[in-house]
């Protein structure tokens, strides 16, 4: 008579986390008499998964009735699979012995792999802000998924992007995988309210993709435009000059007034007006006592935005001839003539 063989027909079984795994095992003979056991792993450290004879195995059920006469099917089902259940499962036949049963023959083993969901995608933007018309890179990372097949898409304000590069690691077979993608995005002035989205689809997600987002407000710097104008004044010996700082982002802004190159006043923007596109406006004014000046005055509005190099706009405030002759008696307003920026 042929010696008993332990047949584990599947070399590997793949199951999604949370599902049940069926591990198949069959004997070719009823002899020798003795129980079968299932183990995870081999050697002294192996874990007992199921013992036909005795024990408590709450997650394990047998596929067929083992006590039935002539039963040769010793397949089991393990419920509520988690990644920690991965490993090689061995169906082992024992020969009845005294005082202990003796291991007789083992199956070749069935590798249980667990289909695992990708982690929530983490999107990160550039370390430093860039100005409109420049290209910035965003990265998206997700880890721990299995199997390897995965789809990643990038969107900007709902529109799919095409300029990106994606890698899935490792290249060979593994228990789980990671994905890394870099998208290149050209900034526009209106991007303060824009968002980039990294979307990941995987078999374990059952059609409900994972999304990671990043706000372009963290990546963009819109430099201000400056306009210096003179406002009408009732008092003859005063000129009110305003500096309109427009369409800048982010908020951080410091403005310095200079009279003939000398610092007159420095202030930090506080009460800002927000535009629809997310940029800000701010206005600063300077009262100039014209009677204190015998000659024309060059007024400079100098703005330092978001730690960048200062930009400025200068205007020449012309002191009229009457003012130059009569000082405070002059009643004509000073004339304002623009000059090229310094």
């Amino acid at each position: 008579e042929d010696e008993l063989q332990v047949i584990q027909p599947e070399k590997s079984v793949s199951v999604a986390a949370g599902e049940s795994a069926t591990l198949r095992c069959a004997m070719t003979s009823l002899i020798p008499v003795g129980p079968i056991m299932w183990f995870r792993g081999a050697g002294a450290g192996r874990e007992l998964i199921y013992n036909q004879k005795e024990g408590h195995f709450p997650r394990v059920t047998t596929v067929s009735e083992l006590t039935k006469r002539n039963n040769l099917d010793f397949s089991i089902s393990i419920s509520n699979i988690t990644p920690a259940d991965a490993g090689t499962y061995y169906c082992v036949k024992f020969r009845k012995g005294s005082p202990d049963d003796v291991e007789f023959k083992s199956g070749a083993g069935t590798e249980l792999s667990v289909r695992a969901k990708p982690s929530a995608p983490v999107v990160s933007g550039p370390a430093v802000r860039a100005t409109p018309e420049h290209t910035v890179s965003f990265t998206c990372e997700s880890h721990g998924f299995s199997p390897r097949d995965i789809t990643l898409k990038w969107f900007k304000n709902g529109n799919e992007l095409s300029d990106f590069q994606t890698n899935v690691d490792p290249a060979g077979d593994s228990v789980s995988y990671s994905i890394h993608s870099t998208a290149r995005v050209v900034l526009t002035r209106g991007d303060v309210h824009s968002q980039v989205i990294c979307e990941i689809a995987h078999i374990t997600l059952q059609g409900d993709p994972l999304r990671g987002t990043a706000n372009l407000s963290e990546a963009i710097r819109v430099p201000p435009t400056l306009e210096v104008t003179q406002q009408p004044m009732r008092a003859e010996n005063q000129a009110n000059v305003t500096c309109q700082v427009s369409n800048f982002y982010p908020r951080g802004l410091q403005l310095t007034w200079l009279e003939n190159g000398n610092v007159s006043r420095t202030e930090t923007a506080s009460t800002l007006i927000e535009n629809k596109d997310g940029t800000y406006n701010w206005m600063s004014w300077l009262l100039v006592n014209t009677c204190a000046h015998r000659d024309d005055v060059v007024l400079t509005c100098q703005v330092e935005h978001d730690g960048q190099q200062a930009v400025s706009k200068s205007y020449a405030l012309e002191i009229s001839a009457h003012q130059k002759e009569h000082g405070s008696d002059i009643t004509h307003e000073a004339a304002l003539a623009p000059t090229a920026p310094l």
Partner: antibody, heavy 118, light 114 residues
Framework: QVQLVESGGGVVQPGRSLRLSCVAS????????MHWVRQAPGKGLEWVAV????????DHVDSVKGRFTISRDNSKNTLYLQMNSLRAEDTAVYYC???????????WGQGTLVTVSS | DIVLTQSPDSLAVSLGERATINCKSS????????????LAWYQQKPGQPPKLLIY???IRESGVPDRFSGSGSGTDFTLTISSLQAEDVAVYYC??????????FGQGTKVEIK
């Protein structure tokens, strides 16, 4: 939840014996291989011994073979390490660890300190 | 026996920055029959026992924050902490379970805050 509580450590002279115990709870003790791992003061981890789920098979690191014996009592959910002929180099914190399959160690006890000194 | 060598022995990283620990094995721990890498990573905080972080080289243990990730195959492996937090200060060990007994560990890498 899984808990492993070691006891039996202390100060002992070279050549003497000590028996460590580890009481397990929160899992079916009799289904798992169990291990002892030690850590000398300021040093790394060193695996010491393993015992099978039923206590019938065991193995030890070469440096303790013939001196240390791992055993278990499944009726008491307890793992033991009998340490004989102790040496100064056996001074360490001894951890009891639950095996996950024949693979990695998924739970560890807090450890018990054994000091071998004259 | 399989020897695991970690590098660096210690590293100081600023909060929020990435920390990378390498583990090199003297022989492969990749089982070609099932394409599994038999490697785990543990974290040991001062005065505490080791805690399992990663197994099968890349699977995060339940409850481990996803800033921890494992990668690599064959003989070269990496543990990455993507954004270091104050509570991540610890010694990290790799361990092989491919060729056992004995189960062997790397010498450990100490991670501190810069």
């Amino acid at each position: 939840q899984v808990q492993l509580v070691e006891s039996g450590g202390g100060v002992v002279q070279p050549g003497r014996s000590l028996r460590l115990s580890c009481v397990a709870s929160g899992f079916i003790f009799s289904n798992y291989g169990m291990h002892w791992v030690r850590q000398a003061p300021g040093k790394g981890l060193e695996w010491v011994a393993v015992i099978s789920y039923d206590g019938r098979n065991e193995d030890h690191v070469d440096s303790v073979k013939g001196r240390f014996t791992i055993s278990r009592d499944n009726s008491k959910n307890t793992l033991y390490l009998q340490m004989n002929s102790l040496r100064a180099e056996d001074t360490a914190v001894y951890y009891c660890a639950k095996g996950s399959g024949s693979y990695y160690f998924d739970y560890w006890g807090q450890g018990t300190l054994v000091t071998v000194s004259s | 026996d399989i020897v695991l060598t970690q590098s660096p022995d210690s590293l100081a990283v600023s909060l929020g920055e990435r920390a990378t620990i390498n583990c090199k094995s003297s022989q492969t721990v990749l089982n070609s029959s099932n394409n599994k890498n038999y490697l785990a990573w543990y974290q040991q905080k001062p005065g505490q026992p080791p805690k399992l972080l990663i197994y099968w080289a890349s699977i995060r243990e339940s409850g481990v924050p996803d800033r921890f990730s494992g990668s690599g195959s064959g003989t070269d492996f990496t543990l990455t902490i993507s954004s270091l937090q104050a509570e991540d200060v610890a010694v990290y060990y790799c361990q092989q379970y491919y060729n056992t007994p004995p189960w062997t560990f790397g010498q450990g890498t100490k991670v501190e805050i810069k």
